[in-house]
Amino acid sequence: YDFTNCDFEKIKAAYLSTISKDLITYMSGTKSTEFNNTVSCSNRPHCLTEIQSLTFNPTAGCASLAKEMFAMKTKAALAIWCPGYSETQINATQAMKKRRKRKVTTNKCLEQVSQLQGLWRRFNRPLLKQQ
C-alpha cells in the first residue's frame, strides 16, 4: 500500500490522543533508552510503511502484536485516514486470524514496540533531527 495520500495530521492526532498511551501501557515501565533504535524512516509515507510492518507482521521472537489495543487503533486510524487502505488489508487480516497465538509479552516484543515508538516520533516530527 502507498501511504502518500493519507491525512497525516489526522493520523498524528490519533497517535497523540490514544495510540501513544496504549504503547506506553504495553511497555509497562520499560524506558525508551533501554533499547537501541535500529529501524528508521525518512518521510511520513515511509514511516507509515515501517509502522505497518512492525505492527502487523510477525517477527522472530514476537509472533504477533496485531491483537494489542495499540495495533487495533493503528489499524482503525489507517483505515479511516488512508484512502483504500482497508481494502488492501482484508486478505492479511484473514491470514492473521489463522496464526493467532497465546498472548505473551516477550523482551523481543518490548524491543519491537520501542522501535514503533521511535517510528511514530519520526512520523510526528518529520522536520526535526533529520537522519
Epitope: 506506553i24 501501557t25 515501565g29 520499560t30 524506558k31 525508551s32 533508552t33 533504535n37 510526528n124 537522519q131
Partner: antibody, heavy 123, light 112 residues
Framework: QVQLQESGPGLVKPSGTLSLTCAVS?????????WNWVRQPPGKGLQWIGE???????NYNPSLKSRVTISVDMSKNQFSLKLSSVTAADTAVYFC????????????????WGQGILVTVSS | DIVMTQSPLSLPVTPGEPASISCRSS???????????LDWYLQKPGQSPQLLIY???DRASGVPDRFSGSGSGTDFTLKISRVEAEDVGIYYC?????????FGQGTKLEIK
C-alpha cells in the same frame, strides 16, 4: 492537579532506619509513571536515590543500594522509602517526585515534586 | 555513573540581561534515537526543584519562552534571554540517559 506529599519522622537515631511515605493525589500510583526519591543535604546539591513502578520494579542508586528499599501501596495510592543503618551523612531534605512519560515512552524528567521533608540523623 | 559538571557555579546577572549556564557530561547523552537525555531544573529559594527543559531542548509545560536549552552529546547550555527577578535560584542539569540519574553541582543565579 497532581500533588505529592512526603511524611515521616523528622529525627532518626544513628544506625536506625529512616522511613518516609509519599502520598499521591490527582494521579493514580498505578498509572504509567515511575515514582522517585531524591535527597538534598543541607546547603548541597541533589542526589537521586531510586525509583519504583507500580509493578514493583525498582532501580536504585548503587551508592545506596545495600541500604535502600522503595515500595508501593496501591490501595493507599502512596509509595515509601526505607533507608537503613543511617548516619549523619544521611541528614537531608528528602523529596518524592513523579517521572511521567512523554508521548514516545521517554522517561527521566520529574514534572511534579513534593515540598520535601527534612530528616535529621542525630542521637 | 555519569558525572555532570556545571559552570559557572555562581552567576550574578543584571535584570533584562541574558544569562548562560554550561553543563558537561562524562559520557555522551545522545541516544540512538537522536535525542539527548538531559534535563534542566530550577530550585527557587525554599522550594522544590521545578522542571524547565527536558530532552536537551524541549520546554516543560508552563515554562516561559525566555528559557531555552541547546547542545548535544556531552556539552549543553541553558540560556535565559532576559533575566527577571523571579529567575533567581539554583539551576541543576540532570542526565536521564541511564540510572543512576545524576545531577550537576548547581549554578546559583543571583541578581546584581
Amino acid at each position: 492537579q497532581v500533588q505529592l506529599q512526603e511524611s515521616g519522622p523528622g529525627l532518626v537515631k544513628p544506625s536506625g532506619t529512616l522511613s518516609l511515605t509519599c502520598a499521591v493525589s490527582g494521579d493514580s500510583i498505578s498509572s504509567d509513571n515511575w515514582w522517585n526519591w531524591v535527597r538534598q543535604p543541607p546547603g548541597k546539591g541533589l542526589q537521586w536515590i531510586g525509583e519504583i513502578f507500580h509493578s514493583g520494579r525498582t532501580n536504585y542508586n548503587p551508592s545506596l543500594k545495600s541500604r535502600v528499599t522503595i515500595s508501593v501501596d496501591m490501595s493507599k495510592n502512596q509509595f515509601s522509602l526505607k533507608l537503613s543503618s543511617v548516619t549523619a551523612a544521611d541528614t537531608a531534605v528528602y523529596f518524592c517526585a513523579r517521572d511521567a512519560p512523554n508521548d514516545y515512552g521517554d522517561y527521566g524528567f520529574f514534572d511534579y515534586w513534593g515540598q520535601g521533608i527534612l530528616v535529621t540523623v542525630s542521637s | 555513573d555519569i558525572v555532570m559538571t556545571q559552570s559557572p557555579l555562581s552567576l550574578p546577572v543584571t535584570p533584562g540581561e541574558p544569562a548562560s549556564i554550561s553543563c558537561r557530561s562524562s559520557q555522551s547523552l545522545l541516544h540512538s534515537n537522536e535525542y539527548n537525555y538531559l534535563d534542566w531544573y530550577l530550585q527557587k529559594p525554599g522550594q522544590s526543584p521545578q522542571l524547565l527543559i527536558y530532552l536537551g531542548s524541549d520546554r516543560a509545560s508552563g515554562v516561559p519562552d525566555r528559557f531555552s536549552g541547546s547542545g548535544s552529546g556531552t556539552d549543553f547550555t541553558l540560556k535565559i534571554s532576559r533575566v527577571e527577578a523571579e529567575d533567581v535560584g539554583i539551576y541543576y542539569c540532570m542526565q536521564a540517559l541511564q540510572t543512576p540519574y545524576t545531577f550537576g553541582q548547581g549554578t546559583k543565579l543571583e541578581i546584581k
